[in-house]
Amino acid sequence: SAPFSFLSNVKYNFMRIIKYEFILNDALNQSIIRANDQYLTAAALHNLDEAVKFDMGAYKSSKDDAKITVILRISKTQLYVTAQDEDQPVLLKEMPEIPKTITGSETNLLFFWETHGTKNYFTSVAHPNLFIATKQDYWVCLAGGPPSITDFQILENQA
C-alpha cells in the first residue's frame, strides 16, 4: 500500500537554509562519504575532508505539524538526498534549485529531523517509519532500525 504521505495532500513550502556545511557521523563515529558519484556510505576517516558536507533546508507543512521537516543537500552542489524504499540506498538527485514547494511523490526529498540530546534522526516523510541509516558494507539507506544505525551526530564548523 502507498505510504500515508502519498495519500494525503500535504504541501511543504521551503522556508530557509538552517544549517550549512555540517558533517554527519553515525554512532560508530563513521562519517558519511560520497561514493561512486550517486551513493553515500559510511567510513571511519583519518581525514575529515573526505566527509560529505551537507546543508539543511527547512520546510513548513500545510498541516500544523510540530515536526521539523528538512531537505539535505551536499554543500556547494545541486545534489539532494533522496529516499527510495526500505533497505534501498538513498540517492543523490540533481536539481537546478531547491524546490519551493514539495508535495506527493516528491516527499522522498524530505525528512523529519528529530533530536534527542546529541543524537539526530532523519525519518523519511515518504516512509514515516523508516530512517536514514548506515549499514555495514552497504550504502547509506532507509531502514527501520537495528542492525542498521539510525542515529547521527552533527559536526559543525569543521575547518
Epitope: 556545511e21 558519511i32 562519504i33 560520497r34 561514493a35 561512486n36 558519484d37 551513493y39 556510505t41 567510513a43 575532508d49 573526505e50 566527509a51 560529505v52 558536507k53 551537507f54 551536499i74 554543500s75 556547494k76 552542489t77 545534489l79 558494507d137
Partner: antibody
Framework: EIQLVQSGAEVKKPGASVKVSCKAS????????MNWVRQAPGQDLEWMGW????????TYADDFKGRFTFTLDTSTSTAYMELSSLRSEDTAVYFC???????????????WGQGTTVTVSS | DIQMTQSPSSLSASVGDRVTITCRAS??????LNWYQQKPGKTPKLLIY???RLYPGVPSRFSGSGSGTDYTFTISSLQPEDIATYFC?????????FGQGTKLEIK
Amino acid sequence: EIQLVQSGAEVKKPGASVKVSCKASGYTFTNYGMNWVRQAPGQDLEWMGWINTYTGESTYADDFKGRFTFTLDTSTSTAYMELSSLRSEDTAVYFCARGIYYYGSSYAMDYWGQGTTVTVSS
Amino acid sequence: DIQMTQSPSSLSASVGDRVTITCRASQDISNMLNWYQQKPGKTPKLLIYYTSRLYPGVPSRFSGSGSGTDYTFTISSLQPEDIATYFCQQGKTLPYAFGQGTKLEIK
C-alpha cells in the same frame, strides 16, 4: 596500503586492439570510481573518462568516445581500458587513477597506477 | 565544458626561490581545484586539493590559493627535488579537465 597496479607495456600494429588492466588493492573497490588518463609522449595529461565501479556505467570525454571502452571485474577489483582500431597517435602512457570526493563535492584523483605504455607501430 | 588555462608553460628558477604558477578556469569552479606533480618518467601525485588543502605527506612549502576562476600554486622555497611538471585540474563538473602543465626547471 592502497595500490593500483597496471599491466605491462604493449606494442601493437595499427588496426589492432589493446586491453590495459588496473588492479586495485587496499580499499573497498566499489566505493570509488576509476578514472583513465592519457599522456602522449612529451604531452600533457588528458582526462579520458571514468567508470562507476558499482554500477559499471562509464562516462567518456568527447575525444575518447567511440573506440575506448572501460570495463570491470569486481570479483578481482580490476578495471580495464580497451582501445580498438589502434592508430599511431594512440601511442601514449595510459594511467588509471582512483577518484575521491572531498567534502562530497570536489573531485580529485588521489591514487594512480604506474602507467602502461602503449606503442602503436607498423 | 570547463577549460583550464595554466601559465606559464615552463619556468626556470633557482633553489630557494619562490615559485608561482597560475590556473584560470573558463567559469567559476567554487574552489574545486587540484594540483598535481609529475616528475620525469613517474606517475602524477596529488599535492593540493580543494584550492588550498595539502594532501597528507606533502611538504608545507607547497601551497595553493584562489577563488572563482583564478587559482595560484606556490612553492615558497624551491628545492632540487621539486623539478617536475605541475598540473591543475578542476573537480567541479564532468569532464574533469587538466591544465596544460607547467614544466619547472632549475637555473
